[in-house]
């Protein structure tokens, strides 16, 4: 089954190569396990930066050496992504699929456009 | 903290209707699926389905179907479960349970007594 | 219907043995996205029932470390490592992986 998720489209990561974004979906309530995937589009490949699954019981959880970290608060998950670099910069597209209990529902956003801008070096100072 | 409290035992003859109620607190009513469960005096525990307490859209099991309708209370956070036409064969004690990933909490049981 | 058979109808154990109950299937009982959701529940004598593991292995929080599932596909086994008399009651396993959902038979656990 289709079901509407909402991202900004555009964010700015900040120097330190952080960017974070709320990823909002349709709520056909009661959904007890939610999982969470973005996807990095560039041109026509999509490549999976990270997914977590949730459950209404308990917090999002990512993997221990994911890139991501997100909270999760009723229909909204707030992500994070860490380390990216300039040529990080893309189209960052959220994926929910509502898994448990059924019907089963997939969502996806529009994309939401990272752009990383890696900072000068500082000057060498003698 | 998160309980469900049931309405108190009923004595019905066959035939009659039944509205046994189920009362939420302590968390998001609308965020959790409501089950039921029956349990006939000395029998184990049989599934009756559950209700979207979001949607308010109910699934029955087979044996259910018909006699049967959960309805909910949103404002009130309360579910019910409804038995028409009341048979000998309903006499037990029927559970609700709050559905996530697994049941927790279930509410202390209303105990049903169907006899002419 | 998913038919969920569980052995033995009743276990007579001492207190501090060990005793395992099965719950065996049907049908595979593995969901879509490939979580098992197989739970245990202990109800004791007037009360309601509590749960104890959910999918399969997962203890619930405050649960004793001496409760254990384990299994796949349509068998499951739930183990209790030293029996205490708090122990005792009647086990149930559950399906929620195939509407609709089914409940085993139950197993009494008493003192032998």
């Known amino acids: 089954k289709g079901m509407h998720a909402a991202q900004p489209a555009v964010v700015l990561a900040s120097s330190r190569g952080v960017a974070s974004f709320v990823c909002e979906y349709g709520s056909s309530g009661n959904a007890a396990e939610v999982r969470v995937t973005m996807l990095r589009q560039a041109g026509s490949q999509m490549t999976e930066v990270c997914a977590a699954t949730y459950t209404v019981e308990d917090e999002l959880a990512f993997l221990d050496d994911s890139t991501c970290t997100g909270t999760s608060s009723g229909n909204k998950v707030n992500l994070t992504i860490q380390g990216l670099r300039a040529m990080g910069t893309g189209l960052y597209i959220c994926k929910v699929e509502l898994m448990y209990p059924p019907p089963y529902y997939v969502g996806m956003g529009n994309g939401t456009q990272i752009y990383v801008i890696d900072p000068e070096p500082c000057p060498d100072s003698d | 903290q998160i309980q469900l409290v049931q309405s108190g035992p009923e004595l019905k003859k066959p035939g009659e209707t039944v509205k046994i109620s189920c009362k939420a607190s302590?968390?998001?009513?609308?965020?959790?699926?409501m089950n039921w469960v029956k349990q006939a005096p000395g029998k184990g525990l049989k599934w009756m389905g559950w209700?979207?307490?979001?949607?308010?859209?109910?699934t029955y099991a087979d044996d259910f179907k018909g006699r049967f309708a959960f309805s909910l209370e949103t404002s009130a956070s309360t579910a019910y479960l409804q038995i028409n036409n009341l048979k000998n064969e309903d006499t037990a004690t029927y559970f609700c349970?709050?559905?996530?990933?697994?049941?927790?909490?279930w509410g202390q049981g209303t105990t049903l007594t169907v006899s002419s | 219907d998913v038919l969920m058979t569980q052995t033995p109808l009743s276990l007579p154990v001492s207190l501090g043995d060990q005793a395992s109950i099965s719950c065996r299937s049907s049908?595979?009982?593995?969901?879509?996205?490939?979580?098992?959701?197989l739970e245990w529940y202990l109800q004791k004598p007037g009360q309601s029932p509590k749960v104890l593991i959910y999918k399969v292995s997962n203890r619930f929080s405050g649960v004793p470390d001496r409760f254990s599932g384990s299994g796949s596909g349509t068998d499951f086994t739930l183990k209790i490592s030293r029996v205490e008399a708090e122990d005792l009651g009647v086990y149930y396993c559950f399906q929620g992986s195939h509407v609709p959902w089914t409940f085993g038979g139950g197993t009494k656990l008493e003192i032998k």
């Open positions: 349970a709050r559905r996530g990933t697994y049941y927790r909490p």
């Open positions: 049908q595979s009982i593995v969901y879509s996205h490939g979580n098992t959701y």
């Open positions: 209700i979207n307490t979001y949607t308010g859209e109910p």
């Open positions: 302590g968390y998001t009513f609308t965020n959790y699926g």
